[in-house]
């Protein structure tokens, strides 16, 4: 699902307030509901009909620094007999999300929002077959 554009209107101050020079603003990176956790079912990535592996990407200049990415293990999907079914495809499920990017310019540090694509898992689909006209 596409994230709505974070337009300038989102960050605009109320009309009664003076404008901030250079378009800068304060950003509190404390997290609301920080203790809220999404718990995955045990080994769901291995029990899925389109199993996947996880890779942790690390970037010290990104917040959060750690982003987990999934990669589909198979081209096809796993059937009830545990065999790869090549009439179907395992495809990644991707979600756009925003992270904060830290940028160094000499001694000054600035922060910018960056859109990243996170693969959260895989699903099984019927592939598209193109017929030559």
């Amino acid at each position: 699902r596409k994230i709505p554009k974070v337009g300038h209107t989102f960050f605009q101050k109320p009309e009664s307030c003076p404008p901030v020079p250079g378009g800068s603003m304060k950003l509190d990176i404390g997290i609301i509901n920080e203790n809220q956790r999404v718990s995955m079912s045990r080994n769901i990535e291995s029990r899925s009909t389109s199993p996947w592996n996880y890779t942790v990407t690390w970037d010290p200049n990104r917040y959060p620094s750690e982003v987990v990415q999934a990669q589909c293990r198979n081209l096809g999907c796993i059937n009830a007999q545990g065999k790869e079914d090549i009439s179907m495809n395992s495809v990644p499920i991707q979600q756009e999300t925003l992270v904060v990017r830290r940028k160094h310019q000499g001694c000054s540090v600035s922060f910018q929002l960056e859109k990243v694509l996170v693969t959260v898992g895989c699903t099984c689909v019927t592939p598209v077959i193109h017929h030559v006209q």
């Epitope: 699902r1 990669q71 198979n74 081209l75 179907m88 495809n89 990644p92 756009e96 592939p127 598209v128």
Partner: nanobody, 123 residues
């Protein structure tokens, strides 16, 4: 969407070689996992070889030691080098790829099949 076009098939004598190509085209896409699948007349489709986006390969027992799958990411093309061909390798060879596509709706992933290329091994 992504179009896959296979080429390189033909008639070859037993013991001969062929190199199949699978070229992917489209607007804004990245090819992930790709496989070569074959179907002989009156038989079920068989997975011959696969290659991941990172270059890891996997082969069916019937292809091990004789076939080599490779990819050229810059050309969005995957190859299947077939050597020591046998009459039982006669089949239509299809390319199947999973690709991530970006269009006006956003980014999504899907599976795509080509039309296939005929390989006939006969003396």
């Amino acid at each position: 969407e992504v179009q896959l076009v296979e080429s390189g098939g033909g008639l070859v004598q037993p013991g001969g070689s062929l190199r199949l190509s699978c070229a992917a085209s489209g607007r804004d896409f990245r090819v992930k996992n790709v496989g070569w699948i074959r179907q002989a007349p009156g038989k079920q489709r068989e997975l011959v070889a696969t290659i991941t986006v990172g270059g890891s390969t996997n082969y069916a027992d019937s292809a091990k030691g004789r076939f080599t799958i490779s990819r050229d990411n810059a050309k969005n093309t995957v190859y299947l080098q077939m050597s020591s061909l046998k009459p039982e390798d006669t089949a239509v060879y299809y390319c199947n790829a999973v690709a991530t596509v970006t269009d006006y709706t956003g980014t999504y992933s899907d599976g795509f099949w080509g039309q296939g290329t005929q390989v006939t091994v006969s003396s």
